[in-house]
Amino acid sequence: KIDACKRGDVTVKPSHVILLGSTVNITCSLKPRQGCFHYSRRNKLILYKFDRRINFHHGHSLNSQVTGLPLGTTLFVCKLACINSDEIQICGAEIFVGVAPEQPQNLSCIQKGEQGTVACTWERGRDTHLYTEYTLQLSGPKNLTWQKQCKDIYCDYLDFGINLTPESPESNFTAKVTAVNSLGSSSSLPSTFTFLDIVRPLPPWDIRIKFQKASVSRCTLYWRDEGLVLLNRLRYRPSNSRLWNMVNVTKAKGRHDLLDLKPFTEYEFQISSKLHLYKGSWSDWSESLRAQTPEEEPTGMLDVWYMKRHIDYSRQQISLFWKNLSVSEARGKILHYQVTLQELTGGKAMTQNITGHTSWTTVIPRTGNWAVAVSAANSKGSSLPTRINIMNLCEAGLLAPRQVSANSEGMDNILVTWQPPRKDPSAVQEYVVEWRELHPGGDTQVPLNWLRSRPYNVSALISENIKSYICYEIRVYALSGDQGGCSSILGNSKHKAPLSGPHINAITEEKGSILISWNSIPVQEQMGCLLHYRIYWKERDSNSQPQLCEIPYRVSQNSHPINSLQPRVTYVLWMTALTAAGESSHGNEREFCLQGKAN
């Protein structure tokens, strides 16, 4: 009943709880002298299903047969309507529609840890939509029985609150769960197990790692476990990896030596435990231990390259460049690089430690034979030095690679190809491809890039530090013993017509011809490698086509003579620049009149 029902009653037959698909009869009847004030024909009883009127009757009672009720709870309310008055609530009832419980499936029990309690889980099957009580029963040796009930609407877990002990690890226990509601009952199949089957150890704790003599090769992992643990699984991985290394160990007694860790690497370690070889289940993985392995001295050798620049008749500038070791080669934090410069005949040597840079520049005499050695040092030691004899890399003309070309290869890549030198190609020990941004001033501060190529290769794809619309000076060196030959070419990965033309800054007269001088186009406006300049001229106020002179682009050139102008005629001159993609717009216009004598 949903209220006091003083004025009447609502009865439900056969029951307030019905099976899905059943029909119920609902009767609403007024108690004596509870109808409308006037004679009873005017009593109008109305039956509501939630907020909807579903039936009515004039008189003292209303009978209604209801079908098709949905799963769950439906509220019916009976009201009385009298002429010219509000409806009065008489009484109401809730009807619960559901199904009998299905047989609980997959009953399984577990005890978490040796000191834990036995808890079981099962699958309820489809929702009954009714109050359903679950009873879990456990029977053991010596006729011992435990029982626990669950009145939660969605019950699929119960903890007995009892602890199984390892005194008789092979003793059998049997669990069964029974579901009961108003429409029926059903029991699971029994689940039989022993202590060893259901005890799931607690995950290991207090995990530590020790490196004997700060060496990665002598590493021991320690942990604590529950007393009966027989097996352990260890898994570990570098923190930046998704793949685990896995190790199974028996009777480890809380320690295990790891032999294959890499130096100077952060690892994540986890451990899991089990009581028996083939019974029971593994514990959850322990909390992760994160630890960095110690450094080891670097392996590998630095990739070193150099550049020579003539200063004057007695001095030359040497710029050394080297690449960082890979993480696996550095095996620690590189603290400094050691550069040793030695004059081979006189034995003079100087050593310098370089920090924070991967280049070094010095000035040495042009005479003598010079060699350098460069190594990388961390807290444990140094890499093997890379030794290079300083030579004139382009001196041997016969070693110069032939037919060097540079072509764009997709976004920000340049494919460099060449032919072996004319001199015995088998003499070549390796090729080095070097590239740097082209700066008209030949700026030595521009970063240098290089890669090494085996002697049988005749191409290399360069992609490191390559930007679109920038021209690169590319050199291919062929090295053989203490000799080298080189060839160079300009190349770009992407190009378009230059954004502006050269700016003419002066026109001077010399013996009947003129010399035009210009300022280079700013690098950011060249939009790739320049191929030609064009000088245009025409008589002022003339509508004729201009004449032009095309000059191949050379980095250092910024003037050119023209000797085909007529004296005492005023000309307008301008310049453009061309890349493989097209011609720039005009540079500035200059007027000039040649003063020389007429023929």
Partner: nanobody, 125 residues
């Protein structure tokens, strides 16, 4: 699924009579109270009459009381509305509906999908 099919409408002179029928299917007709509802051109739904699930009680809107009679035949799943002394203001499209979807209290338009096409009644001289 629930289906309701009305028939019997037509053109009639003021003062004349018509008998509307409704054939129900797709549900247990005898357990449901039923209603007649009408909709005049450009107007909302207006409840006209109802009969309870036993057929023993009937209700009428004030505007039709004494002129219209509702009845049902559970054996044939039929609902009827006998309309006498028709007036021009009775002109409308007439629908039958479950009482729970449209009663003298309110119409629940979310169930209107169950309704038939209705039958047109025109009262005119």
């Amino acid at each position: 699924q629930v289906q309701l099919q009305e028939s019997g409408g037509g053109l009639v002179q003021p003062g004349g009579s018509l008998r509307l029928s409704c054939k129900a299917s797709g549900f247990t007709f005898s357990t449901y109270a039923m209603s007649w509802v009408r909709q005049a051109p450009g107007k909302g739904l207006e409840w006209v009459s109802a009969v309870n699930s036993g057929g023993l009680s009937t209700d009428y809107a004030d505007s039709v009381e004494g002129r219209f009679t509702i009845s049902r035949d559970d054996a044939k799943n039929m609902l009827f509305l006998q309309m006498n002394s028709l007036k021009p203001e009775d002109t409308a499209r007439y629908y039958c509906a479950k009482y729970e979807d449209c009663s003298d209290y309110m119409c629940h338009r979310d169930r209107a999908g169950y309704w038939g096409q209705g039958t047109q009644v025109t009262v005119s001289s």
